[in-house]
Interface confidence: medium
């Protein structure tokens, strides 16, 4: 078993966020309807988010860490699907309603797990994966979202998530942090960032930053059953007006040695 709980990947690199256990290999995910049940609801929600974003952006001047920087962080937390597990399996859940936080403000991606028995401390692994397609562009292009939804429905696969479901080889994958017992270890790319795993398995950012947009996978691995690697994911999106992006990006060049 690997030390620090690192290097435990998503099943087949698919990034579908499914629970996996040898006794139920064909466990299928529930549909992910995270933008409403129809195109009109989706458009309404997109419009509401845009209005909320505008209001928050205009109020940023009073925030010392982001004065003059028109930016907001949108966080979509998606309940990743998990199946009813047999005895001794781990059940992992990532769930929280839609969040809006200001850039540089803290955010917590909740993750909880349940085990039928806990002879040893499980390893909690949070991994980051970049979006399979441009989530930000789609958020401001309701028409393209509608077209995509129609295509999904026509294909008879309403549970398909185009932002999450693609091979790891075509996107960036990083270990964010791992936790075993009380020991939390940050991945290489996140060294120097105030990020930690708190509570049961929650991933907490003391300050959100540009480049944090993506899909965050919470995996829990039991030393007793390496095949019972359950995981769930949350989507995090960092948005900002073009003028704000140029101002903010230089400040994040001083981090860990980047590839």
């Amino acid at each position: 078993m690997q030390q620090d709980g690192l290097g435990v990947g998503t099943r087949n690199g698919s990034g579908k966020g499914r629970s996996v256990h040898p006794s139920w290999p064909w466990c299928a995910p529930r549909p992910l309807r995270y933008f409403g049940r129809d195109a009109r609801a989706r458009r309404a929600q997109t419009a509401a988010m845009a209005l909320l974003a505008g209001g928050l952006s205009r109020g940023l001047g009073s925030h010392p860490a982001a004065a003059g920087r028109d930016a907001v962080v949108f966080v979509w937390l998606l309940l990743s699907t998990w199946c009813t597990a047999p005895a001794r399996a781990i059940q992992v859940t990532v769930s929280n309603p839609y969040h809006v936080v200001i850039l540089f403000q803290p955010v917590t991606l909740p993750c909880t797990y349940q085990m039928t028995s806990t002879p040893t401390q499980p390893i909690v692994i949070w991994k980051y994966k970049s979006f399979c397609r441009d989530r930000i562009a789609d958020a401001f292009s309701p028409a393209s979202v509608d077209n995509q939804l129609n295509a999904q429905l026509a294909a008879g696969n309403p549970g398909y998530n185009p932002y999450v479901e693609c091979q790891d080889s075509v996107r960036t994958v990083r270990v964010v942090a791992t936790k075993q017992g009380n020991a939390v270890t940050l991945g290489d790319y996140y060294q120097g960032r105030r990020i930690t795993i708190t509570g049961n398995a929650d991933l907490t950012f003391d300050q959100t930053a540009w480049g944090d947009s993506g899909v965050y996978y919470c995996s829990v691995v039991s030393a007793q059953d390496l095949q019972g690697n359950n995981e769930a994911y949350a989507e995090l999106i960092v948005l900002g007006r073009t003028s704000g992006v140029a101002e903010l990006l230089p400040g994040f060049q001083a981090g860990p040695i980047e590839d």
Epitope: Q2, Q3, D4, L6, G7, A65, F104, R174, V175, T185, L186, G187, D188, Y189, Q191, G192, R193, R194, Q207, A209, G251, F252, A254, G255, P256, I257, E258, D259
Partner: antibody
Framework: AVTLDESGGGLQMPGGALSLVCRAS????????MQWIRQAPGKGLEWVAG????????RYGSAVKGRATISRDNGQSTVRLQLNNLRAEDTGIYFC????????WGHGTEVTVS | ALTQPASVSANLGGTVKITCSGG????????YGWYQQKSPGSTPVTVI????KRPSNIPSRFSGSLSGSTNTLTITGVQVEDEAVYFC?????????FGAGTTLTV
């Protein structure tokens, strides 16, 4: 357990070159930055070089910039420091360390330039 | 440059604090580590990293705290085996830097 083992030290000639190797085990090597840090006799710690997890990002201390090359082989879990045009002031113990916020050290390998 | 006292002394069982300042600022904060070296040239041991994180093999009597841009290493209930040189380190712009070291005498 995390272990870091350095090798390649010894007596070197001024103007020559040396190649130090650090072999890592006990953790997912490719997920961590690796650093080289040295200590001259009777002196404090001096950061020499660092390399990102995938290996394409590198940084060097001012004392070795232009003379040093840090590289890594994630398949073999090794990180290498090549130091050219050796000087007497390069004498010291060279430590391999894990992560930018150093949380593990190797035992070191002694280099004498004389 | 990182600034730390050249030496400090402590009574057995007492508490000692070693400060370090001058670290580099990154992502709106400062990041320090503390490294214990019991004899010159021996392997350093990380006692605190990322300001206040303690490796699992380090006794709980070691703690770190950040106040402004200054980091403090506190050893509560000093033991004889804590006698060593303590180097503070900071992380800035993908580089590490170290202080000159503080000799702790028990």
């Amino acid at each position: 357990a995390v272990t870091l083992d350095e090798s390649g030290g010894g007596l070197q000639m001024p103007g020559g070159a040396l190649s130090l190797v650090c072999r890592a085990s006990g953790f997912d090597f490719s997920s961590y930055e690796m650093q080289w840090i040295r200590q001259a006799p009777g002196k404090g710690l001096e950061w020499v070089a660092g390399i990102s997890g995938a290996g394409s990002g590198t940084r060097y201390g001012s004392a070795v910039k232009g003379r040093a090359t840090i590289s890594r082989d994630n398949g073999q879990s090794t990180v290498r420091l090549q130091l050219n045009n050796l000087r007497a002031e390069d004498t010291g113990i060279y430590f391999c360390a894990r992560s930018s916020n150093i949380d593990a050290w190797g035992h070191g390998t002694e280099v004498t330039v004389s | 440059a990182l600034t730390q006292p050249a030496s400090v002394s402590a009574n057995l069982g007492g508490t000692v604090k070693i400060t370090c300042s001058g670290g580099g600022r990154y992502a709106e904060s400062y990041y320090y580590g503390w490294y214990q070296q019991k004899s010159p040239g021996s392997t350093p041991v990380t006692v605190i990293y990322w300001n206040d994180k303690r490796p699992s093999n380090i006794p709980s009597r070691f703690s770190g705290s950040l106040s402004g841009s200054t980091n403090t290493l506190t050893i509560t209930g000093v033991q004889v085996e804590d006698e060593a040189v303590y180097f503070c380190g900071s992380y800035e712009d993908s580089r590490s830097a170290f202080g000159a070291g503080t000799t702790l005498t028990v």
